[in-house]
């Protein structure tokens, strides 16, 4: 008599199981297991019992234990049932937008999963079950029809599979598809209202407002504002069933002339549009031209101011002579001119309104280096052993590098706190150097010895 344990097993796909084959006779001629599965025998004492590890179980299988005893041969089967959740649970794509009242078909496809007898497909709206059916066929397909309502807006539809292995002592395995969100809409027949300036200056900003009532759902409405080919980026404020879209519009010289301002409202697959014209005029800022923005000290510099042909300009507060769109001044660059601003102001009359524009340019003057008594004293007298900080500031643009050397070799630590010793005494040659040249200055350090009374 051959027996097997366990006689029935449910296990996950790819799993392993221990199967014991036993025989009632003490000295069987043969005791083993017949199976296509990978097996490994575990060594046990005695001859009438063998334990096998069966691994990588991919599908249902019926391994058979057999034994050959003096009184004959016998067999016993164990039933291995493999379970696995579906490999694909998918809801067929839904059109994004649906008008209220339309019938919508939901279709769910399920691939794989076993055992099929324990597999159920459920169609849901949110957590509400719309339909529940056993999984049949490969792939299994379940469909249902929904009448779209206003309150369905934003509802999530999904498909779920349930592999119920609780009767076998396991759990309920659930797989859920990616949700599909339904969007419903109502767009009124009236066009949007558009408020904007009728004229707009090049290189300035204007404000455009577009609004519409009677929308559902108002938060899902797309508003497209455009001036000619230029898309605007509005800030949208919502009411219960209305919106107001506000945008800044910037225009360039290329937009000069009459432009079409458009406001389009798109909801679902419908749209409403309003058109208006805007006149754009040009008045660029005046141009300040320096012969060179960076010059050496003593260089002649011409500063020119040029503006719109119909404008009148002033340069550094002095009106053009004669009054018109051009002005200029001449100067010889001095160190004091370094960083000096040259400002041009232009005035243009547009439709009876005076418009002002300014532009400023800065002059950089390269000069120096300079070493003078005020910033680099020629004489220091310090008490011996006192703490002192030698100071010597070189001026120039670019800022010069400075070195002070005694006998061409001993540096004076400029800007550092030093303890005054006899070694510090002497005459130092301070040399300031930059790309603009080099200057030298002698600095004498005297050290006063302490008096002993």
């Amino acid at each position: 008599q051959t027996s097997v344990s366990p006689s029935k097993v449910i296990l996950p796909r790819g799993g392993s199981v221990l199967v014991t084959c036993s025989t009632s006779c003490d000295q069987p001629k043969l005791l083993g297991i017949e199976t296509p599965l990978p097996k490994k025998e575990l060594l046990l004492p005695g001859n009438n019992r063998k334990v096998y590890e069966l691994s990588n179980v991919q599908e249902d299988s019926q391994p058979m234990c057999y034994s050959n005893c003096p009184d004959g041969q016998s067999t016993a089967k164990t039933f291995l049932t493999v379970y696995w959740t579906p490999e694909r649970v998918e809801l067929a794509p839904l059109p994004s937008w649906q008008p209220v009242g339309k019938n919508l078909t939901l279709r769910c496809q399920v691939e794989g999963g076993a055992p099929r007898a324990n597999l159920t497909v459920v169609l849901l709206r949110g957590e509400k079950e719309l339909k529940r059916e056993p999984a049949v066929g490969e792939p299994a397909e379940v469909t249902t029809t929904v009448l779209v309502r206003r309150d369905h807006h934003g509802a999530n539809f999904s498909c779920r599979t349930e592999l119920d292995l609780r009767p076998q002592g396991l759990e309920l395995f659930e797989n859920t598809s990616a949700p599909y969100q339904l969007q419903t809409f109502v767009l009124p027949a009236t066009p949007p209202q558009l408020v904007s300036p009728r004229v707009l200056e090049v290189d300035t900003q204007g404000t455009v407002v577009c609004s519409l009532d009677g929308l559902f759902p108002v938060s899902e409405a797309q508003v497209h504002l455009a001036l000619g080919d230029q898309r605007l980026n509005p800030t949208v404020t919502y009411g219960n069933d209305s919106f107001s879209a506000k945008a800044s519009v910037s225009v360039t010289a290329e937009d000069e002339g009459t432009q079409r301002l458009t406001c389009a409202v798109i909801l679902g697959n419908q749209s409403q549009e309003t058109l208006q014209t805007v006149t754009i005029y040009s008045f660029p800022a005046p141009n300040v031209i320096l012969t060179k923005p960076e010059v050496s000290e003593g260089t002649e510099v011409t500063v020119k101011c040029e503006a719109h042909p119909r404008a009148k300009v002033t340069l550094n507060g002095v009106p053009a002579q004669p009054l018109g769109p051009r002005a200029q001044l001449l100067l010889k660059a001095t160190p004091e001119d370094n960083g000096r601003s040259f400002s041009c102001s232009a005035t243009l009359e547009v439709a009876g309104q005076l418009i002002h524009k300014n532009q400023t340019r800065e002059l950089r003057v390269l000069y120096g280096p300079r070493l003078d008594e005020r910033d680099c004293p020629g004489n220091w007298t310090w008490p011996e052993n006192s703490q002192q900080t030698p100071m010597c500031q070189a001026w120039g643009n670019p800022l010069p590098e400075l070195k002070c050397l005694k006998d061409g070799t001993f540096p004076l630590p400029i800007g550092e706190s030093v303890t005054v010793t006899r070694d510090l005494e002497g005459t130092y040659l301070c040399r300031a150097r930059s790309t603009q040249g080099e200057v030298t200055r002698k600095v004498t350090v005297n050290v006063l010895s302490p008096r002993y009374e």
Epitope: K403, D407, T409, F410, P411, R431
Partner: antibody
Framework: QSVEESGGGLVKPGGTLTLTCTVS????????MGWVRQAPGKGLEYIGI?????STYYASWAKGRFTISKTSTTVDLKITSPTTEDTATYFC???????FGDGYRLWGPGTLVTVSS | AYDMTQTPASVEVAVGGTVTIKCQAS??????LLWYQQKLGQRPSLLIY???KLASGVPSRFKGSGSGTEFTLTISGVQSDDAATYYC????????????FGGGTEVVVK
């Protein structure tokens, strides 16, 4: 601006050797000049310096053995009683602290002194 | 005495790596420190002056730092051409000196 050493070569121990550094492109009345040596396979060793005034300053180990002097365009290094340990390449160098880092590398190419009997 | 101690004596670095060389003065030399590079058979060439200023024509991967008695030369993104011996030199005092130069650091690039 350049500096170049001369006067190197083979000298017997105990003799006297004078190396000369010739400068061009700058005035020795404005700049200090120094001597540095490097024994074969060894590091740089400061010998001493002559200031723009003509005052001399030596490394503690070099006092009495080396003498630095100058004319309007040359700086001399006199080595008294050289030993084999004085075998080295001798460099003439314009004092580094007059440097503003603008590509300043006022070292001569060096002259090799070999002290051997 | 205003003498210099340089560490390490030798260092090995891979191409693209970073090398740090330290130099210590026996007394305060403020920022009066130079760094030189010397390749075999050549005269030394100035890299850094005033402890941290780059001499003209020197690549920015060389960086000097420190003041007083502690100074560092850092070479970042080392290239094979950087294989050389590097020396520090104090330039504060020409008298009261045993050796104004550090002992040197040999940089070997792998």
């Amino acid at each position: 601006q350049s500096v170049e050493e001369s006067g190197g070569g083979l000298v017997k121990p105990g003799g006297t050797l004078t190396l000369t550094c010739t400068v061009s492109g700058f005035s020795l009345s404005s700049y200090a000049m120094g001597w540095v040596r490097q024994a074969p396979g060894k590091g740089l060793e400061y010998i001493g310096i002559i200031g723009s005034s003509g005052s001399t300053y030596y490394a503690s180990w070099a006092k009495g053995r080396f003498t630095i002097s100058k004319t309007s365009t040359t700086v001399d290094l006199k080595i008294t009683s050289p030993t084999t340990e004085d075998t080295a390449t001798y460099f003439c160098v314009r004092d580094p602290y007059d440097s503003f880092g603008d590509g300043y590398r006022l070292w001569g190419p060096g002259t090799l002194v070999t002290v051997s009997s | 005495a205003y003498d210099m101690t340089q560490t390490p004596a030798s260092v090995e670095v891979a191409v693209g790596g970073t090398v740090t060389i330290k130099c210590q003065a026996s007394e305060n030399i403020y920022r009066y420190l130079l760094w030189y590079q010397q390749k075999l058979g050549q005269r030394p060439s100035l890299l850094i002056y005033d402890a941290s200023k780059l001499a003209s024509g020197v690549p920015s991967r060389f960086k000097g730092s420190g003041s007083g008695t502690e100074f560092t030369l850092t070479i970042s993104g080392v290239q094979s051409d950087d294989a050389a011996t590097y020396y520090c030199q104090q330039a504060y005092s020409s008298s009261n000196v045993d050796n104004a130069f550090g002992g040197g650091t040999e940089v070997v690039v792998k």
